[in-house]
Each structure stands twice: as C-alpha cells, then as structure tokens.
Amino acid sequence: GSMAHSDGIFKKEQAMCLEKIQRANELMGFNDSSPGCPGMWDNITCWKPAHVGEMVLVSCPELFRIFNPDQDMGVVSRNCTEDGWSEPFPHYFDACGFDEYESET
C-alpha cells in the first residue's frame, strides 16, 4: 500500500540525508564545536549545515509528490540562529499536507 511505499521512501531519504550531511560537513569544515547549525534529518526532510544568520529552504519531501503529483512543490524554511535551528516555517502540515512520518506499525 501507499504507507509501505512511503516507509521505503523515508528510509532511503534518511540514509541519503546522513550521507549528504557528512559530505557537507567535510566541504564546509564543520565539526561538533563549529558555530552554526549542524545538518539534520528531522524525520521529514534533510537540512544541510548552515552558518548563523543563514536561511535554508527545502522543498516538501518526495512523499508529497506521491500524494500530489500535479501540484507545485511546497517550500519550508528554517533560520540558523545562535541558539540553533528555528522551527520550520511555514509548518510542514500547512506547506506539505503532513507533519510527521507515519509508519504502518
């Protein structure tokens, strides 16, 4: 079913995200003590590492495309602040139609 399909997509996206973050950390010279915001997988989509003051934009994840193949992709942003990542804006639920990954189990 679509849930099983989405389960596979999310596991794949998560694995790809962790690889992307590792590569980005190497390229940007980021480590655990670096100022800024570390890359993260927030259980919905991937956020690349960012410097303080930077705003990062991401498209709604692939699951959105399954449910809405003919629609424009929504966009969500986070700001990297001195206190870390801001909350996503707009909220995933409003921009993408869902706000957390649900598995069948």
């Epitope: 809405n68 966009v75 707009p90």
Partner: antibody, heavy 123, light 107 residues
Framework: QVQLQQSGPGLVKPSQTLSLTCAIS??????????WNWIRQSPSRGLEWLGR?????????HYAVSVKSRITINPDTSKSQFSLQLNSVTPEDTAVYYC?????????????WGQGTLVTVSS | DIQMTQSPSSLSASVGDRITITCRAS??????LNWYQQKPGKAPKLLIY???ILQSGIPSRFSGSGSGTDFTLTINSLQPEDFATYFC?????????FGPGTKVDIK
C-alpha cells in the same frame, strides 16, 4: 456524499460554555486524509477560523491564537462526530458557527460545511 | 496574522458580464489560497483551491489566478445563480484568515 449536521443550543449566557456538535456522514472523524474544523461568522469579525482536530495515528489539534485559551475541539470516534467547546463566552462570541471538513490537494481547503448554528450570547 | 483584503467590497453586474474580484495578502502566501461563494443564510461553498484549481462540480466559467500576494477570481458570463458574496482565504499560516468578502449583486 459527505454531510455534516450541527446541533447545540442557540442561546448561551455570558461567562458560560458554548457547546456544539458536528455529526459526520459519508466520512469518518478518524480519516487519515481529513481535518475537522470549526469556523464562525459575525458581522463585526467576518469569517473566522477557530481550530481543527485530525487523526494521523494520534489525535492532534490546532487552534487560532485568538481563542486558544478558551477552546477545545474533541473527536468522538464512537459516533463519528466532533465537538466545539468555547469557555467564558462574551457577547462578542455571538456568531453563526460552522463545522467543516478540511482536505488537502496542494493546500488545505474546506470542501464540506455544516448548515451553521446561530449562537447568541446574552443574559 | 496575515491580513486579507478584497476589492471591490461590492459590485453590480448584469447576467452575461465578465467580472474580476481581487484578493491581496499582507505577506506572500505563495499559491495557498482558496475562494468560496456564500449565499444568504447558507454556508460558504468551495469554488477554487491552491489559487487556481477548480473544485469538482464547479462550472468552468469560474477561474482563479495569482501567486504571492495578489490573486484574482474571474467569473466569465455571469449567471443568475452567481449573485452572491465571494471570500478568499489564505491556507498557509494559522490562523487561516478570510477576506472581508465581495458582494456581487444585480445591476
């Protein structure tokens, strides 16, 4: 065919609790695709979205900040209905109250509405 | 809150006319905008969602366009049943605010 049928008193005294129910037919309050919303309309405030409940493996609620401290929206899965409770009402809460189903296709929209209930807050 | 404004607030038109109603958001809402029609004593009825997509069962004389802050609802060849009040609604930031409405009446 989705239908929403509202029920509840049309007159509430100031400081008391406004309670309305919306019975769903043709869909389920536990649907993983829908949200279940309350909206009100008055001449002074126009159409005002109040809040919603929805099920995605667990129940969630979103409320408008303007009423967040006073509002509760509860699903009743046994009767496939949902309710609105608005506490500490004042005459400013006098309005026509609507329930509506929210659906997603590129954005959230309200595609089926209840018939509306005029609620007057007066002593 | 995002403020939604509509213009005109009312308009008089004749059957067969083409009319345009404008909705403006106080900040960008991309294409997260809905249009509703309401007749006296009735609940609002969904016409268009996501800025431009016609709801199932709505006649093709209704169309929506726009993105960002400026949106339009167009009714081609106005029919007697189209005399009503029209509302826009932004659907991206809680609270999901509505415009004040545009009343379309018979000239």
């Amino acid at each position: 065919q989705v239908q929403l049928q509202q029920s509840g008193p049309g007159l509430v005294k100031p400081s008391q609790t406004l309670s309305l129910t919306c019975a769903i037919s043709g869909d389920s309050v536990s649907s993983r695709q829908a949200t279940w919303n309350w909206i009100r309309q008055s001449p002074s405030r126009g159409l005002e979205w109040l809040g919603r409940t929805y099920y995605r493996g667990k129940w969630k609620n979103h409320y408008a900040v303007s009423v967040k401290s006073r509002i509760t929206i509860n699903p009743d899965t046994s009767k496939s209905q949902f309710s609105l409770q608005l506490n500490s009402v004042t005459p400013e809460d006098t309005a026509v109250y609507y329930c509506a189903r929210g659906m997603w296709q590129g954005n959230w929209f309200l595609d089926h509405w209840g018939q509306g209930t005029l609620v007057t807050v007066s002593s | 809150d995002i403020q939604m404004t509509q213009s005109p607030s009312s308009l008089s038109a004749s059957v067969g006319d083409r009319i345009t109603i404008t909705c403006r958001a106080s900040q960008s809402i991309s294409r997260y905008l809905n249009w509703y029609q309401q007749k006296p004593g009735k609940a609002p009825k969904l016409l268009i969602y996501a800025g431009r997509i016609l709801q199932s069962g709505i006649p093709s004389r209704f169309s929506g366009s726009g993105s960002g802050t400026d949106f339009t609802l167009t009714i081609n060849s106005l029919q007697p049943e189209d005399f009503a009040t029209y509302f826009c609604q932004q659907a991206i930031i809680n609270p999901y605010t509505f415009g004040p409405g545009t009343k379309v009446d018979i000239k």
